[in-house]
């Protein structure tokens, strides 16, 4: 069974998948479609790196540009380094600028919805 066939079988169970499962899935060549990706739990998507999302979505990663104003895509973009976003070749903007340090202050983030940044 290839990655795409595997994805079809598990698609209906993915809604509540934790980050760890999504990271594991990104190694399986599943090419998750964007509609399924956007139904995932936001808190599970946010910790994923650009490389992991690229592997998870495969060719469908291109659709992030078309859906950049919708959650969880919008929130995920805000969490990524701009340099990493640039590798997607989509012209996505809003990532963390080069030279900034991300502080994982979960209370601050829970209140504001955005990560806390320290300038260069």
């Amino acid at each position: 069974m290839n990655g795409s066939e595997y994805f079809v079988k598990i698609q209906s169970f993915l809604g509540g998948a934790p980050t760890e499962d999504l990271k594991a899935l990104s190694q399986q060549n599943v090419s998750m479609d964007l509609a399924t990706f956007m139904k995932l739990r936001t808190d599970a998507v946010l910790p994923l790196t650009v490389a992991e999302v690229q592997k998870l979505l495969g060719p469908h990663v291109e659709g992030l540009k078309a859906e950049e104003r919708h959650r969880p895509v919008r929130d995920w973009i805000l969490r990524q380094r701009q340099d990493d976003l640039d590798t997607l070749g989509l012209g996505l903007q809003g990532g963390i600028p080069n030279g900034y340090l991300v502080l994982d202050l979960s209370m601050q983030e829970a209140l504001s919805g955005t990560p806390c940044l320290l300038g260069p």
């Epitope: 509609a35 919708h70 590798t87 070749g89």
Partner: antibody
Framework: EVQLVQSGAEVKKPGASVKVSCKAS????????MHWVRQAPGQGLEWMGN????????YYNERFMSRVTMTVDKSTSTVYMELSSLRSEDTAVYYC??????????WGQGTLVTVSS | DIVMTQSPDSLAVSLGERATINCKSS????????????LAWYQQKPGQSPTLLIY???TRESGVPDRFSGSGSGTDFTLTISSLQAEDVAVYYC?????????FGGGTKVEIK
């Protein structure tokens, strides 16, 4: 003004390979993916695959997986599509098309590839 | 693969009259989160490359005349030309961009009656 200029028509023998180029201008080359679509004479459109011009990552329609290779040259804002082991049914017009998000917003003029012994 | 079925295969319409083209997909093209339908319409005039008319099922591409409109959701979609002009003679294709391989309908040829 966005422009996609493709290489000229080719005539190839069965079993040979063909490499079609698509030179882009009028926009930031690394901000938009490029797709390849073909159209056999008098027939409809068939998606072959797409490529991320920033990283060079490419994805192919499984129908062509073993025979197609898409590459990019950022220095000249050019993408390439190579199709190997050509057969007569590969005779078609091959188009490059720039993505607008997922849809194909701009198309090249097309390159006719004729496969004949 | 998602199968796209267009109807009719060809259509002859008088100048100034309405032309309606249907496109049906074998599975939903709706993103239930964003409410976007991943369907595009293209026009291909004789001897030319295709051009984009509509994306997200109903969003008209910049520069496309407002006589062209797209509608539908899920699996059933329609392209309407409200008042056919001579320059609209072409083949029209729908395409899904929900899941690879992105697939096209077989095309509908629109002619003047």
């Amino acid at each position: 003004e966005v422009q996609l200029v493709q290489s000229g028509a080719e005539v190839k023998k069965p079993g040979a390979s063909v490499k079609v180029s698509c030179k882009a201008s009028g926009y930031t080359f690394t901000n938009y993916w490029m797709h390849w679509v073909r159209q056999a004479p008098g027939q409809g459109l068939e998606w072959m695959g797409n490529i991320n011009p920033s990283s060079g990552d490419s994805y192919y329609n499984e129908r062509f997986m073993s025979r197609v290779t898409m590459t990019v040259d950022k220095s000249t804002s050019t993408v390439y599509m190579e199709l190997s082991s050509l057969r007569s049914e590969d005779t078609a017009v091959y188009y490059c098309a720039r993505s607008g998000g997922l849809w194909l917003a701009f198309w090249g003029q097309g390159t006719l590839v004729t496969v004949s012994s | 693969d998602i199968v796209m079925t267009q109807s009719p295969d060809s259509l002859a319409v008088s100048l100034g009259e309405r032309a309606t083209i249907n496109c049906k997909s074998s599975q939903t093209l709706l993103n239930s989160v964003s409410q976007n339908n991943y369907l595009a319409w293209y026009q291909q005039k004789p001897g030319q490359s295709p051009t984009l008319l509509i994306y997200f099922a109903s969003t008209r591409e910049s520069g496309v005349p407002d006589r062209f409109s797209g509608s539908g959701s899920g699996t059933d979609f329609t392209l309407t030309i409200s008042s056919l002009q001579a320059e609209d003679v072409a083949v029209y294709y729908c395409q899904q961009h929900y899941r690879t391989p992105y697939t096209f309908g077989g095309g509908t040829k629109v002619e003047i009656k």
